[in-house]
């Protein structure tokens, strides 16, 4: 009887753990390449997939190009941005490129915007070379409040690699705020 009770308790515990896990907010958003802006200046990327391929979202909201936090908590945020150029893509206007990503938090309640993470490098990409590639990965642990919005900005968006395994960002809640 004791063993049976332990098994029942254990299964209830597993169920409780599982349901709590399922309620934990997360998002993995992949680039929607049909709507990438042009130019070399820093731009906000507003077109992301949230429900196809590797992209998924749960207990967070994606709206107007921004990932919106629905639950207070400590979150791990990450972004991976790949830049690439092939000679068939066109003629590079300069060899000197600043390839950057900025992950930004915007608060509506107290109107403010903060860069949480940035990464990148200056690169020399000769237009006479056949192929160039560069990847940036940033990640960090942040306290986020309900209603705050996360967005991604990049330089030289025309060079973005449009594959879902190349250009993406996301977040997952790690713990509550005490």
């Amino acid at each position: 009887i004791r063993a049976e009770k332990a098994m029942v308790d254990g299964s209830w515990l597993d169920l409780a753990k599982r349901s709590k896990l399922e309620a934990q907010p997360f998002a993995h958003l992949t680039i929607n390449a049909t709507n990438i802006p042009t130019g070399s200046h820093k731009v906000s990327l507003s077109s992301w997939y949230h429900d196809r391929g590797w992209a998924k979202i749960s207990n967070m909201t994606f709206s107007n190009g921004k990932l919106i936090v629905n639950q207070d908590g400590f979150y791990y945020l990450y972004a991976n941005i790949c830049f690439r150029h092939h000679e068939t893509s066109g003629d590079l206007a300069t060899e000197y490129l600043q390839l950057m990503v900025y992950v930004t938090k915007t608060s509506i309640k107290i109107p403010s915007s903060h860069t949480l993470m940035k990464g990148g490098s200056t690169k020399y990409w000769s237009g006479n070379s056949e192929f160039h590639f560069y990847s940036i990965n940033v990640g960090g642990f942040f306290k986020l409040r309900s209603g705050e919005e996360i967005s991604v900005e990049v330089s030289n968006p025309s060079l973005l690699d449009p594959d879902q395994d190349a250009t993406y960002f996301g977040a997952f809640k790690v713990r509550d705020i005490d």
């Epitope: 042009t38 130019g39 070399s40 200046h41 893509s89 066109g90 003629d91 590079l92 206007a93 300069t94 060899e95 000197y96 490129l97 000769s126 237009g127 006479n128 030289n156 968006p157 025309s158 060079l159």
Partner: nanobody
Framework: EVQLVESGGGLVQPGGSLRLSCAAS????????MGWFRQAPGKGREFVSS????????YYADSVKGRFTISRDNAKNTLYLQMNSLRPEDTAVYYC???????????????????WGQGTLVTVSS
């Protein structure tokens, strides 16, 4: 005021060579890509070649690849086009143009170029 002045055109026999120059003033020459275009009688303006601001990368239309060479001297604010193995079909007015847009990629569409010279005539005939 931006000014682009081409020179070096003329009459040349097939197989001959010419060197076109384009003197630029009124803007920071070394900061911007430049291009050469041409317009044959009764035809539209077509891309010939372009070069980045530093001169490190050069691009050519397939029809001139291996025969024409674009270069620039940023100290002299001058753009060049060395034309070898000239053919009768190269006969046209040649224009230099400045690309001032902050784009990652250069366009080969002449309408995207902001400033133009008055052109210099190149005639290839025997």
């Amino acid at each position: 005021e931006v000014q682009l002045v081409e020179s070096g055109g003329g009459l040349v026999q097939p197989g001959g060579s010419l060197r076109l120059s384009c003197a630029a003033s009124g803007f920071t020459f070394s900061s911007y890509p430049m291009g050469w275009f041409r317009q044959a009688p009764g035809k539209g303006r077509e891309f010939v070649s372009s070069i980045t601001g530093s001169g490190g990368s050069t691009y050519y239309a397939d029809s001139v690849k291996g025969r024409f060479t674009i270069s620039r001297d940023n100290a002299k604010n001058t753009l060049y086009l060395q034309m070898n193995s000239l053919r009768p079909e190269d006969t046209a007015v040649y224009y230099c143009a400045a690309y001032i847009r902050p784009d990652t990629y250069l366009s080969r569409d002449y309408r995207k170029y902001d400033y133009w010279g008055q052109g210099t005539l190149v005639t290839v005939s025997s």
